[in-house]
């Protein structure tokens, strides 16, 4: 799996996970989140050579058609597979409210 | 939705719905399906700006996050959405086999 | 039970030849895009060479006129043979069917040295 255990411990540049912390109030502009202050989101990038964790039949067949034509510019990307949630503690007045925001966190990733 | 109805009557360079033909002797070298010669098999590409088809809350985290950064090499990537199957002809010696192939046909698109 | 199994792995010196070999069962092999792989410690998986059913051949830059991926339908055989092998060619050569599916071998080790 192209997750941190296998991404963040090889030098890749094939489709892998890559580490991104986002500061809600300096990354995006954000104040209306107390808490956390940010988090590691994560995100996918990298190139998706022949057969590298190619997710559907299109993505293999797109994989391969790429290396036959390399000129060609369609060829499959990296993106992510497995999302996890990110519980976070906001005000609406006085009144603090948890909320689960769900695909927040990029565990994983294909070429797709 | 970034599928043929709204793609293919628009120019658009953010992320789309491509056509693509792929003949598989061609194209892929394969040999061994005998129907059909080929098949649209299209493909998805372009750029995903703000909140442009971002399928979840990370990816338009991801496009805020690039918006704001655009220097940063994190951003959202345009892949399939919808897929169809392909339904083929070939032979074992000479015995007809007729397969469908799942997820061979790209019928939409998204930012993921 | 499908199954790749390569052999023809060894040690060689820098200059020399060597020619792997792919057994295939369980899948139709005639049909099949048959490719090598090779994985050096601390480095990422890459395609050496392909072969697709049609004989369409594709190789890496770095072994482009060094190897030549080949098949043998009625054996169910794939081979890549590698000349003038260096130091860098060392690495765990894998072998790689392609047909509806991607289904792989346990690799062999190649080891390049003086």
């Known amino acids: 799996a192209l997750d941190a255990a296998y991404c963040f411990r090889n030098v890749q540049d094939n489709c892998c996970l890559r580490p991104l912390y986002i500061d809600f109030k300096r990354d995006l502009g954000w104040k209306w989140i107390h808490e956390p202050k940010g988090y590691n989101a994560n995100f996918c990038a990298g190139a998706c050579p022949y057969l590298w964790s190619s997710d559907t039949q299109h993505s293999r067949v797109l994989s391969l058609y790429n290396t036959i034509n390399p000129e060609a510019s369609a060829s499959p990307c990296c993106v992510s597979q497995d999302l996890e949630p990110l519980t976070i503690l906001y005000y609406i007045g006085k009144t603090p409210k948890i909320e689960q925001l769900s695909n927040m966190i990029v565990k994983s990733c294909k070429c797709s | 939705a970034l599928d043929a109805a709204y793609c293919f009557r628009n120019v658009q360079d953010n992320c789309c719905l491509r056509p693509l033909y792929i003949d598989f002797k061609r194209d892929l070298g394969w040999k061994w399906i005998h129907e059909p010669k080929g098949y649209n098999a299209n493909f998805c590409a372009g750029a995903c700006p703000y909140l442009w088809s971002s399928d979840t809350q990370h990816s338009r985290v991801l496009s805020l996050y690039n918006t704001i950064n655009p220097e940063a090499s994190a951003s959202p990537c345009c892949v399939s959405q919808d897929l169809e199957p392909l339904t083929i002809l070939y032979y074992i010696g000479k015995t007809p086999k007729i397969e469908q192939l799942s997820n061979m046909i790209v019928k939409s698109c998204k930012c993921s | 039970q499908l199954q790749l199994v390569e052999s023809g792995g060894g040690l060689v010196q820098p200059g020399e030849s060597l020619r792997l070999s792919c057994a295939a069962s369980g899948i139709i092999f005639s049909a099949s895009t048959m490719a090598w792989f090779r994985q050096a410690p601390g480095k990422q998986r890459e395609l050496v060479a392909l072969?697709?059913?049609?004989?369409?051949?594709n190789y890496a830059d770095s072994v482009k006129g060094r190897f030549t991926i080949s098949r043998d339908n009625a054996e169910n055989t794939v081979y890549l043979q590698m000349t003038e092998l260096k130091f860098e060619d060392t690495a765990v050569y894998y072998c790689n069917a392609f047909w509806l599916k991607a289904y792989w071998g346990q690799g062999t080790q190649v080891t390049v040295s003086s």
């Open positions: 072969i697709t059913d049609g004989d369409r051949t």
